[in-house]
Interface confidence: low
Amino acid sequence: GELETSDVVTVVLGQDAKLPCFYRGDSGEQVGQVAWARVDAGEGAQELALLHSKYGLHVSPAYEGRVEQPPPPRNPLDGSVLLRNAVQADEGEYECRVSTFPAGSFQARLRLRVLVPPLPSLNPGPALEEGQGLTLAASCTAEGSPAPSVTWDTEVKGTTSSRSFKHSRSAAVTSEFHLVPSRSMNGQPLTCVVSHPGLLQDQRITHILHVSFLAEASVRGLEDQNLWHIGREGAMLKCLSEGQPPPSYNWTRLDGPLPSGVRVDGDTLGFPPLTTEHSGIYVCHVSNEFSSRDSQVTVDVLDPQEDSGKQVDLVSAS
């Protein structure tokens, strides 16, 4: 007869490891007992358990509660055991020694490999601001055994750099994602992707990018100066800008206080029926935590009577 086992058994941390050991014997042969031991190089054998054909399973005190037989139905020639809740310290060489009748003893070795899946963490970098040079957007760290793979999934253009630290039973991998911040990156996802043989699927951590910026300010409403004449109702100036965080707006008049009746409504300056006292230089001040911008315009309220008077003069002059 002969023993059937595996060269390597791979299990994820916390799962149960099945250590296979099956005696394929000739008809009439019987297995008397199966002894399992841990046999790491340089250390003496440490007994795990004894599977006896008559007395059943005996587990050594060091492994009490952690070694079991596979659930029934069981083949009397099957000496496999389950090692419950595998931990990293269980990684190593194991030996099953099978005593048969009448063929004698057989032994086989296997290596138990315990995969430690990573628990990745993503740390955003410093606040991103438009105008910065190459800046750290985020770093992603994952520690496991064996070393995990850390990559990035994003449509944002950037550069990555990785470094690895080896520990006694695991390795930590850190990958950094650097980019040159621009407003188009706002709200874009940056996903750290961690691959590892102990994971059924890649682990993904998504960070949403926030880039502070403030666009130049401009004022709309004066496109047609002829509309700004005495008596006109509903005249307004609108300040145009955009930013992250969203900006606030403030209106002032450069050559004095805002005239009475002029309404400030956020980015809009609303005028009552126009008079000449509304002529002046108006300033829109836009600001957010990142920056501030100004835009100024000159309002010149026309007097239609003056204009028509001039026309009469011109006619009479000719």
């Epitope: 916390g14 799962q15 899946p117 963490s121 996802p189 951590i205 998504t206 949403i208 926030h210």
Partner: antibody, heavy 122, light 107 residues
């Protein structure tokens, strides 16, 4: 398939205590943050507490802070909620739920238990 | 705490209808928003995460959109099994908070 099964609910008097358990199966329990969420009869969902995968970090809703304690035993694949100084307003179905596997922030919850009813009444 | 306001609180619709539920946050939460479906006597089920990502196994008739403070859950063609209560939830800050729910009933 991940399964979460809550137990430990029941009728308790105001000021009393109760310990809820949530047994997990089908995945690596110790790799995930877990939360308790409750739902008063006929009302909406209210987040109660959360514990990180290794139990180092715990958060609570203001309404239960100082009275409830969340804990976990990864070796037993079990989440707990110790509820002390119970009040009538704690009456609810209590759900345990697992934080989504692929994000480290936040509390969007991809697997939920069937819930256990806690009734606080004299 | 961030307040989440859903509208409407209930609606009646027929099979095949397009249904839209909105959720507004009391402050900007980027895309840290999830949508859940709950049927009577059952636990909630995650439909959408990160505002617009469809959870594995959820039918493609469900979709989410929005960012910042205003979010939408859309069911493109209502099916009999979709009659339920829907909740939005922010997880931008602790504590995470839920909307008050929208009950979708048969017309």
């Amino acid at each position: 398939e991940v399964q979460l099964v809550e137990s430990g609910g029941g009728l308790v008097q105001p000021g009393g205590s109760l310990r809820l358990s949530c047994a997990a199966s089908g995945d690596i329990f110790g790799s995930y943050a877990m939360s308790w969420v409750r739902q008063a009869p006929g009302k909406g969902l209210e987040w109660v507490s959360r514990i990180s995968s290794h139990g180092a970090s715990r958060d609570y809703a203001d309404s239960v802070k100082g009275r409830f304690t969340i804990s976990r035993d990864n070796s037993k694949n079990t989440l707990y909620l110790q509820m002390n100084s119970l009040r009538a307003e704690d009456t609810a179905v209590y759900y345990c739920a697992r934080q989504t596997e692929d994000r480290s922030y936040g509390y969007d919850l991809d697997y939920w238990g069937q819930g256990t009813l806690v009734t606080v009444s004299s | 705490d961030i307040q989440m306001t859903q509208s409407p609180s209930s609606l009646s619709a027929s099979v095949g209808d397009r249904v839209t539920i909105t959720c507004r946050a009391s402050q900007g939460i980027s895309s840290y928003l999830a949508w859940y479906q709950q049927k009577p006597g059952k636990a909630p089920k995650l439909l959408i995460y990160a505002a617009s990502s469809l959870q594995s196994g959820v039918p493609s008739r469900f979709s989410g959109s929005g960012s910042g403070t205003d979010f939408t859950l859309t069911i493109s063609s209502l099916q009999p099994e979709d009659f339920a209560t829907y909740y939005c939830q922010q997880h931008y800050t602790t504590p995470p908070t839920f909307g008050q729910g929208t009950k979708v009933e048969i017309k």
